[in-house]
Amino acid sequence: SASDYNSSELKTACRKHELYVSFQDLGWQDWIIAPKGYAANYCDGECSFPLNAHMNATNHAIVQTLVHLMNPEYVPKPCCAPTKLNAISVLYFDDNSNVILKKYRNMVVRACGCH
Amino acid sequence: SASDYNSSELKTACRKHELYVSFQDLGWQDWIIAPKGYAANYCDGECSFPLNAHMNATNHAIVQTLVHLMNPEYVPKPCCAPTKLNAISVLYFDDNSNVILKKYRNMVVRACGCH
């Protein structure tokens, strides 16, 4: 992912990591009634050669990986990103203090891949 | 990108970069007849707060960005990945030396976003 900011260890391969997000931690508790939080998850890890089947790599990611190996200073590796996302339903107050139930798309990471 | 592991400088924002891929450089010239190469492009750049409209961010990416701000050591920023990909047609020799024209999906990056 874009944030391999200061690690000196070997990164694990691209995969889904568990992450619970609390709406209170985000400061959203005053307008979100329910749920109190949700399992958002996130993607992280290396997209290194060879990209195996578990990595859900696109054709472009495979080509980019090969170009990176030839030209690592100018072309980055593909990055580990969500390939499947789910929605969640949220009960919240709108600007007029009405209680609204709304489905928010692309909120939960179900699967990750190299893109 | 995955290799900007320890930088403290500001990277440019997530965007599409031009990249021409030569099939000869990849060592594929013996089986790919045409084209000789193609404009594959790639995505690179920061997915930093705030994620503006140009960054084609998903709801999950927006949430992840906020969690990263609270907890940068454990949760990475979203990564800059293709949001739109195009196919290319390739003329090649198969294992039996037949000439085949095939459309390969997801070969060209048309747009990038934060995921």
């Epitope: 290194s48 190996l69 030839m70 100018y74 | 290799s3 900007d4 400088e9 500001l10 990277k11 690179d44």
Partner: antibody, heavy 121, light 111 residues
Framework: QVQLVESGGGLVKPGGSLRLSCAAS????????VHWVRQAPGKGLEWVGR??????????AYAASVKGRFTISRDDSKNTLYLQMNSLKTEDTAVYYC????????????WGQGTLVTVSS | QSVLTQPPSVSGAPGQRVTISCTGS?????????VHWYQQLPGTAPKLLIY???ERPSGVPDRFSGSKSGTSASLAITGLQAEDEADYYC???????????FGGGTKLTVL
Amino acid sequence: QVQLVESGGGLVKPGGSLRLSCAASGFTFSSYVVHWVRQAPGKGLEWVGRIKDHKQGYTTAYAASVKGRFTISRDDSKNTLYLQMNSLKTEDTAVYYCARVERSKSGFDNWGQGTLVTVSS
Amino acid sequence: QSVLTQPPSVSGAPGQRVTISCTGSSSNIGAGYSVHWYQQLPGTAPKLLIYGSSERPSGVPDRFSGSKSGTSASLAITGLQAEDEADYYCQSWDSSQTLVVFGGGTKLTVL
């Protein structure tokens, strides 16, 4: 033609600081990744670090042996690469080279002549 | 201790063929990264000799060739000449963070 010229080397005491410069000419400096490589007397080449081009946000990386002590920067308007060296140790004594990375296969296709840094009390 | 392993020295008579090996691991050469070779004549800066594992920059004689297989690479010099006497270094990248790695260098002596 492509030219890289290092300067700023000299004698410095342990714990001291020094700033090396590498003046580039004959090419579009801002579009290239550039590195520092050093060579201790009678020894092999050792990678020090690099700074990427403007397109890649000038991101830096360093060898473990210099991380936290050395800082690489560049000024594209002056076509110059810098290496700020702090908390110098005797083992930092070496000829320091700057090198340009060619854009198709990432080889170091042009090197400066080197500048000698001697760390001694 | 260098990440890439080269023999400290090799030698050959004029006209002979010599090879210099460069052995890495699954995190560098074995990860698929290209290998570059540099020639350093006495008292001078290194010069790119082979790039992309097997390609020669313009001006480099075809007596010099490079190859790569698995976790190692090699540089071959045919028709050895006195002016080939120099130090030779291989270079690649480490896949965990795309950091540059060098071999320890090989001193070529022309007998």
